[in-house]
């Protein structure tokens, strides 16, 4: 006789990463009894709440329940109804946030409390909506690329089932690009981490870690743009700002009210002679890479090495996974191969820049143009990041992997604070159960 | 700005398939689901299904399960309405819409200008 | 799925007359959008999330209600304002229409 399938023991969870720029909800599924175990957990569906992100909606919140109905609806669809009442649902909300609540902590909090009271009218077993800081968010996106490629279990193999595994278990280090923020995060090799603020201890399946992270507020590409305009603004004769960061040919008009709307340009900030002014590109990739290296600020370093703005930075280690912005513009750019040298990438980008606005715009007639216009910018930009504010060189350019999925799952924080927050991390090595881990039974 | 523009008209016998097109410019195709719309002559409307462009998985109402299919080509930015085994009660105008909120937080509704299927044999 | 009830299927009134919609869901939905749509034309958008005039609605319209009643309200009827109109939940799948009010000139 045949055998009854035995009814699949599985649990679900759910995060929404309200970014910035935009909000994604991430499903994801385990085995039930195997909760302890590495690598486990996977991604069965992401869903693009479809807008701008959750800062946007300051002055409408009323409406914040219609901008996620559609993938919270999504996620009553994935997951099957009889698990809907134990499924945890996570939102984490990063740098978009952290930049409203810097302007009024109490608009900050309207926005969450509207957030918590949508996402508690669902049938989920609803946890909560915070501001996770940019040292948490550091910190997860490392542990998500590290469980996901394998680095936390300790039984070695002799095959690899991941890209970029390097079979062995020396960890990978987190390179993740927001709208608003930027995150480095990795272990760094026998070095004292000098600034208490950077420093994380793990226990993770019975091994310590040592690690480093940092998250730059404001150095988001998004926010790194507006940065970027207030300050070449302040020195522009008329209210034309030739942008060598925008392709030839390219013509956009931006209200100063717009570009001093952000805590990002505070800095930057004076009365001008103007309230418009017109970006006018001219697509120089070595000019514009000169523009954005003066948001570095590298004269002044209180350790014995720093990144920009006198943060502490170790010396880099061992291979690194560059993720979210650093792989969606790469991407786009086609420039993701690992074959591609560091050299290759520049002199790629400046053909890229140099083309015609009318060329490109030809070339990429389904791209929405706010976001083809900012490609050149953001590949300079991530070039420039990468090498003078983090230190990468031609040569370690081959230890970043760009990276948008591992094992089908999304390269980002979400995973990680959902390990966390439900526990499925464990400090210790937890102990085999007979026939969890055996090829035949 | 945002513009669907629809096929033409198509006269069909019952039993064929067609396939309508709807074809969109002003903003990233991948942002926002694009949704079908039935409404025969005099009646009400009726919504078939969608597609989300950025993951390519569609919803469809039960109703119209089984002789509908929605499809993209993302390389054109165009979605489509298959519909086969046609039967004359399947005669209405189709309808292609979006919506949601911009950059801005603005919400907005769009839909293409209709295409007309008349089945007769 | 939830069905809309629109009610009165019909209205006839003269030019300067306040007119009163309603849509009526078979269960609770968290907003209501309304249409308005005119002959051998798409519908167009005209109220959304219950209560907010889409662009370049006049002010006369208004909408309200929660839960299971909502109601669109012309404060007083122009000529313009003869067409259909459909209200829509968007708050779960399958989306769904009212069957419709006809505004007819009297």
């Known amino acids: 006789t045949q055998n009854k399938a035995l009814p699949e023991n599985v649990k679900y969870g759910i995060v929404l990463d309200a970014g910035s720029s935009h909000t994604s909800l991430y499903i994801y599924k385990w085995p039930a009894e195997k909760e302890n175990d590495t690598g486990v957990v996977h991604q069965v569906e992401e869903c693009r709440v479809k807008g701008p992100g959750i800062s946007k909606f300051v002055q409408k919140v009323n409406e914040i329940g219609i901008y996620l109905t559609d993938c919270m609806e999504r996620a009553r669809e994935v997951i099957p109804r009889s698990q809907h009442q134990e499924t945890p649902v996570y939102l984490g909300a990063t740098a978009g946030m952290r930049l409203l609540r810097m302007e009024s902590e109490e608009l900050a909090d309207r926005v969450l409390d509207v957030v918590e009271r949508s996402l508690s009218n669902y049938p989920f077993d609803f946890q909560g909506a915070r501001i996770i800081t940019g040292q948490e968010e550091g910190a997860y996106g490392w542990i998500t690329i590290n469980y996901l490629l394998g680095k936390f279990s300790q039984k070695t193999r002799w095959f690899s089932i991941v890209p970029y595994e390097t079979n062995n278990q020396e960890t990978f280090g987190a390179l993740d690009l927001g709208g608003a923020s930027t995150q480095v995060t990795f272990v760094p090799q026998n070095q004292t981490i000098e600034s208490p603020d950077n420093a994380l201890q793990f226990r993770l399946y019975g091994k310590d870690y040592n690690v480093y992270t940092h998250s730059f507020l404001c150095y988001g590409k998004d926010q790194a743009l507006w940065q970027k305009l207030a300050k070449d603004i302040q020195v522009a004769s008329n209210e034309i700002l030739r942008d060598p960061c925008f392709h030839p040919g390219y013509k956009k008009v931006v209200n100063v009210s717009d570009l001093y709307k952000t805590p990002c340009t505070k800095r930057f900030e004076m009365t001008l002679p103007f309230q418009q002014f017109e970006i006018q590109g001219i697509g120089n990739y070595q000019q514009c890479h000169q523009s954005i290296l003066e948001l570095f600020n590298t004269s002044y370093c209180p350790y014995s090495q720093c990144a920009f703005n006198g943060i502490f930075l170790p010396p880099l280690q061992g291979d690194f996974g560059a993720f979210s912005a650093f792989y969606f513009v790469m991407k786009f750019l086609n420039l993701t191969s690992e074959k591609v040298s560091q050299e290759k990438v520049t002199e790629m980008m400046k053909k890229f820049c140099a083309q015609p606005w009318e060329e490109i715009k030809t070339s990429y007639a389904g791209v929405k143009e706010k976001y083809l216009s900012e490609y050149c910018f953001s590949g300079t930009y991530i070039l420039s990041l990468l090498l003078q504010g983090y230190h990468f060189t031609a040569d370690s350019w081959e230890h970043i992997h760009f990276i948008g999925k591992i094992q089908g799952s999304d390269a980002g924080w979400t995973l990680g604070y959902m390990l966390n927050l439900t526990n499925m991390i464990p400090a210790e090595q937890p102990l085999s159960t007979p026939l969890s881990h055996s090829t035949y039974v | 700005e945002v513009q669907l523009v629809q096929s033409g008209p198509e006269v069909k016998k019952p039993g064929a398939t067609v396939k309508i097109s709807c074809k969109v410019s002003g903003y990233s195709f991948t942002d926002y689901n694009l949704n079908w719309v039935k409404q025969p002559p005099g009646k009400n409307l009726e919504w078939i299904g969608n597609i989300d462009p950025y993951s390519g998985g569609t919803r469809y109402n039960q109703k119209f399960k089984g002789r509908f299919t929605i499809t993209i080509d993302q390389s054109i930015n165009t979605a489509y309405m298959h519909l086969r085994s046609l039967r004359s009660e399947d005669t209405a105008v189709y309808y292609c819409?979006?919506?949601?909120?911009?950059?801005?937080?603005?919400?907005?509704?769009?839909w293409g200008q209709g295409t007309m299927l008349t089945v007769s044999s | 799925e939830i069905v809309l009830t629109q009610s009165p299927a019909t209205l006839s009134p003269s030019p300067g007359e306040r007119v009163t919609i309603n849509c009526s869901a078979s269960s609770s939905v968290s907003y209501m959008h309304w249409f308005q749509q005119k002959p051998g034309t798409p519908p167009r958008l005209w109220i959304y999330?219950?209560?907010n005039l889409a662009s370049g609605i006049p002010a006369r319209f208004s909408g309200s209600g929660s839960g299971t009643e909502y109601t669109l309200t012309i404060s007083s009827m122009e000529s313009e304002d003869f067409a259909v109109y459909y209200c829509?939940?968007?708050?779960?799948?399958?989306?769904?229409f009212g069957p419709g009010t006809k505004v007819e000139i009297k």
């Open positions: 829509q939940q968007r708050s779960s799948y399958p989306l769904t």
């Open positions: 819409g979006l919506y949601g909120y911009d950059d801005d937080a603005n919400y907005f509704d769009d």
């Open positions: 999330a219950t209560s």
